[in-house]
Interface confidence: low
């Protein structure tokens, strides 16, 4: 089974994410809670990684980009940043489904399913909040499993 | 407050094993990549070994390949390291260090704990 | 493996002056170098990352500049709480080998 490779450069995404990070995580008041679970991400077959990827960036797309209350024009820069770049990694995985790479199986719909779970169980804001904190799991998950990166 | 705090240290005898553990208060350790870094009485610092939590994966410097286990528990949001067939060169002050984040800047640490003594000598 | 090598060892200068250490990497690391500061007895503090970002409260006394494999950390200004050891480190960690991920030999700093 080929990867489905990507060709965003995630030292971009990174960047924007460390420089966000203590601020998302020092509001977080929920410490011991976690959306992306571990051991969920793990569990992942390597036939459901475009999908389960694909999943990940649509949540993060259509409900943690769109539900955070954060004001500070610095912070909404670097998540309209990181945002834009997800939609890149996007583009980047419809070459895989087009060759068929990127079929769902009912693990990685159930996998999903516990991460909106997940979500659903804080009051929307914090949930934003803290998912918006767990961007790194999302960006070692990326990383680990399609990574092909440009040249720095 | 955000804390690290290193136990386990001590004597041990040339050819024995040690095992310590590093306990994470203030945050999830689950969120973050973890080191352990020592540092032989008067010398430099020594990097000896990565655990990512998100991949359950571990990184060893050659040092101590073979010799090193890194682990940790998630409910006890404590971070462990094994380190079998010491030898005196083994001797130094233990650190465990978080690093700033993930892929890119998993090996750069903004937390340290104060660290631990191990003497290895009969 | 990448060798990270450290000079000076020592170097000694007077309040208000200026200090400068150099790293130098076997290999390119790109800007993946941070600087520690250590004093004696207590555990390492981050200063920079990314070669020449300062970390949060760390005084833009400090300054890290360089690429690939010459690095700089520039101490002005100095004061006497800034006698310690410092330390460079590589982590350019999309290397399956953790030696990597490795210290310079040290600087110790002397102020007057």
């Known amino acids: 089974l080929r990867r489905c490779l990507i060709s965003v450069d995630m030292r971009l995404i990174e960047k924007s994410f460390h420089e966000i990070k203590r601020a998302m995580q020092t509001k977080d008041t929920f410490k011991n809670v976690t959306i992306l679970s571990l051991e969920n991400l793990r569990s992942i077959k390597p036939g459901d990684v475009c999908c389960m990827t694909n999943n990940l960036l649509t949540f993060y797309r259509d409900r943690v980009f769109q539900d955070h209350q954060e004001r500070s024009l610095e912070v909404l820069r670097r998540i309209s940043s990181i945002a834009n770049s997800f939609l890149c990694v996007q583009k980047s995985l419809e070459r895989c489904q087009v060759h068929r790479q990127c079929n769902c199986s009912q693990e990685a719909t159930n996998a999903t399913r516990i991460i909106h779970d997940n979500y659903n169980q804080l009051e929307v804001s914090s949930a934003a909040l803290k998912s918006l904190g767990e961007l790194n799991i999302l960006l070692a998950w990326i990383d680990r499993n399609h990574l092909e990166t440009p040249a720095a | 407050q955000e804390q690290l705090k290193e136990s386990g240290g001590g004597l041990v005898q040339p050819g024995g094993s040690l095992k310590l553990s590093c306990k994470a208060s203030?945050?999830?350790?689950?969120?973050?990549?973890f080191s352990w870094v020592r540092q032989a009485p008067g010398k430099g610092l020594e990097w000896i070994g990565y655990?990512?939590?998100?991949?359950?994966?571990?990184l060893s410097a050659h040092t101590v390949n073979g010799r090193l286990t890194i682990s940790s528990d998630n409910a006890q949001n404590t971070l462990y390291l094994q380190l079998n067939s010491l030898t005196a060169a083994d001797t130094a002050t233990y650190f465990c260090?978080?690093?700033?984040?993930?892929?890119?800047?998993?090996?750069?640490?903004?937390?340290w704990g104060p660290g631990t003594l191990v003497t290895v000598s009969s | 493996d990448i060798v990270m090598t450290q000079t000076p060892a020592s170097v000694e200068a007077a309040v208000g002056g200026t200090v400068t250490i150099k790293c130098s990497a076997s290999?390119?690391?790109?800007?993946?170098l941070s600087w520690y500061q250590q004093k004696p007895g207590q555990r390492p503090k981050l200063l920079i990352y990314?070669?020449?970002v300062l970390t949060d409260g760390v005084s833009s006394r400090f300054k890290g500049s360089g690429s690939g494999t010459e690095f700089t950390l520039t101490i002005s200004d100095l004061e006497a709480a800034d006698a310690a050891t410092y330390y460079c480190?590589?982590?350019?960690?999309?290397?399956?080998?953790?030696?990597?991920?490795?210290f310079g030999g040290g600087t110790e700093v002397v102020v007057k």
């Open positions: 260090a978080r690093g700033i984040g993930y892929v890119y800047y998993g090996y750069t640490y903004d937390l």
């Open positions: 203030g945050f999830p350790l689950s969120s973050y990549g």
């Open positions: 655990l990512d939590p998100v991949f359950g994966s571990t």
């Open positions: 290999a390119s690391i790109y800007e993946y």
């Open positions: 990314g070669a020449s």
């Open positions: 480190q590589s982590y350019n960690d999309g290397s399956s080998s953790g030696d990597a991920h490795v």
